[in-house]
């Protein structure tokens, strides 16, 4: 039997978890409606883009400094400055030494959709979150995971895989996302920025978190996930951002001490098993759900994306450890690993509490845009 | 379904070569393109270790034991990998296993590697 995870059921620490509403409570313009300049040809012009310049925005090769400091929605320009995106260029990476289409990367040549066609699709992700404009559904329900806790044995992988850091985790995490919709965890990994550029993947009205962490599950209906790739609910992922707290976050001080052994592109080191749930915020009752698709090639479509409204707070130096530790192909480090936030296209961002309702404070007589389409539909 | 199978093992004499193959089947949205693989090995008695890796971007990674003698490649053209080892040793001998990490793991069923003259 499966048992929703409860509101005093603190992660590790102290508590990982960060504030019940930060989502939606700053009034920041969306980045569409930031200056498109210096916009070079990419996997982001798409009709109705959303997203700032994809500028091609490799990381710096040399060391940075210890004095990073996170961002924090408050202190945040209301508009980014024109020349100066946040963004890494979407695109792909043909290896020099061959024309292999598969070998992508964040940046360069060529676009994605030549690496695949699925990533031109219409429905794709990330995309940004606007809570004023989410249809509030009471059917979706507290997201219910049991198997989380993993004993220290059997050791679990951690991998550097020159995109992401990746922990593959073992049989047995069963997560529900409402009745008869039932997935396993597969893995998770991480996306960041670099000192003082967030790098979350999802964005929330235009407002990017510093980090942002993926669990990807496979849906029980399926063995193997080539078999459930572009089928819809065949894949999901549950994402939370990661922001600056005040104390160490001693779940993910689990993995985060581990990287230095795995600094190198496509290396590995042994962890122990660890409360996996502990590295995602406590309230699994307020969250975001939309279709979308993988974040990085194949692209594939049908992924059910559900994004926490809760956040979790790593200390800066933890911050700055995951930008600052890894490095990726060509000698260059392993930041601002995100893809650029695609256009919603018609689709509509479900939440599972009164978002667009309480949310904004500036809002004089809120009113609920879109309605909800019936869970599981 | 995605397959793993490997080939190339056999007996080969210390300080000869071997080149041994990885190849993907059934992969009908390719996934293998996007899989970092590796080559791990497993001597009797001893834990399954890592040999080599390569990923999305083509970077490359070896165990020590064998840097400087072990070369990965990928020809994703054709759904492979290999593993091109030489100057090989008795201690090189075991059953080496694919793995491709896609989402998931996927493994071969292994080719056994002898080093003996």
């Known amino acids: 039997q499966r048992l929703p995870r409860m509101q005093e059921d603190s992660p590790l620490g102290g508590g990982s978890s960060g504030e019940d509403d930060p989502l939606g409570e700053e009034d920041l313009p969306s980045e569409e409606d930031s200056p498109r300049e210096e916009d070079p040809p990419g996997e982001e012009d798409l009709p109705g883009e959303e997203d700032l310049p994809g500028e091609e925005d490799l990381p710096e090769v040399k060391p940075k400094s210890e004095e990073e400091g996170s961002l924090k929605l408050e202190d945040l320009p209301t508009v980014e400055a024109p020349g100066d995106p946040q963004e890494p260029q979407n695109n792909a990476h043909r290896d020099k030494e061959g024309d292999d289409q598969s070998h992508w990367r964040y940046g360069g040549d060529p676009p994605w959709p030549r690496v695949s066609p699925a990533c031109a699709g219409r429905f794709q992700s990330p995309v940004d979150i606007r809570p004023q404009l989410a249809a509030f559904c009471p059917a979706l329900r507290p997201l219910e995971l049991l198997g989380f806790q993993l004993p220290p044995l059997p050791e679990l992988r951690l991998r550097n895989n020159g995109h992401s850091v990746q922990l593959t985790l073992p049989p047995g995490l069963e997560m529900a996302l409402g009745p008869g919709r039932e997935y396993r965890a597969l893995q998770l990994h991480l996306h960041w920025g670099a000192a003082g550029r967030p790098g979350s993947e999802h964005t929330v009205e235009g407002h990017r978190f510093p980090a942002e962490i993926h669990v990807v599950h496979l849906s029980t209906a399926f063995a193997r996930v080539d078999e459930a790739l572009g089928r819809p609910g065949g894949l999901a992922v549950l994402a939370a951002f990661l922001e600056e707290g005040p104390e160490e976050n001693s779940a993910y001080e689990q993995l985060l001490s581990r990287l230095e052994e795995i600094a190198e592109e496509g290396s590995e080191t042994q962890v122990p098993g660890l409360d996996i749930s502990a590295l995602l915020p406590s309230d699994f009752s307020r969250y975001f759900q939309y279709e979308g698709s993988l974040t990085t090639p194949p692209c594939a479509q049908g992924v059910i994306w559900t994004v926490f409204n809760q956040t979790v707070m790593l200390s800066a130096k933890q911050l700055h450890t995951l930008s600052d530790t890894l490095w990726g192909p060509g000698d260059s480090r392993l930041q601002l690993n995100f893809r650029a936030t695609q256009p919603l296209n018609g689709r509509v961002i479900e939440a599972s509490f009164p978002a667009g309702v309480d949310s904004s404070p500036r809002a004089a007589e809120p009113v609920q845009l879109n309605s909800c389409l019936a869970a599981g539909d | 379904e995605v397959q793993l199978l490997e080939s190339g093992g056999g007996l080969v004499q210390p300080g000869g070569s071997r080149r041994l193959s990885c190849a993907a089947s059934?992969?009908?949205?390719?996934?293998?393109?996007?899989?970092?693989v590796a080559w791990y090995r497993q001597a009797p008695g001893k834990q399954r270790e890592l040999v080599a890796v390569?990923?999305?971007?083509?970077?490359?990674k070896y165990s020590d034991s064998v840097k400087g003698r072990f070369t990965i490649s990928r020809d994703s053209s054709k759904n492979t990998v290999y593993l091109q080892m030489n100057s090989l040793r008795a201690e090189d001998t075991a059953v080496y296993y694919c793995?491709?990490?896609?989402?998931?793991?996927?493994w071969g069923q292994g080719t056994q590697v002898t080093v003996s003259s």
């Open positions: 059934g992969n009908s949205v390719n996934i293998f393109s996007f899989a970092a």
């Open positions: 390569i990923t999305t971007t083509g970077g490359t």
């Open positions: 793995n491709a990490d896609y989402l998931q793991d996927y």
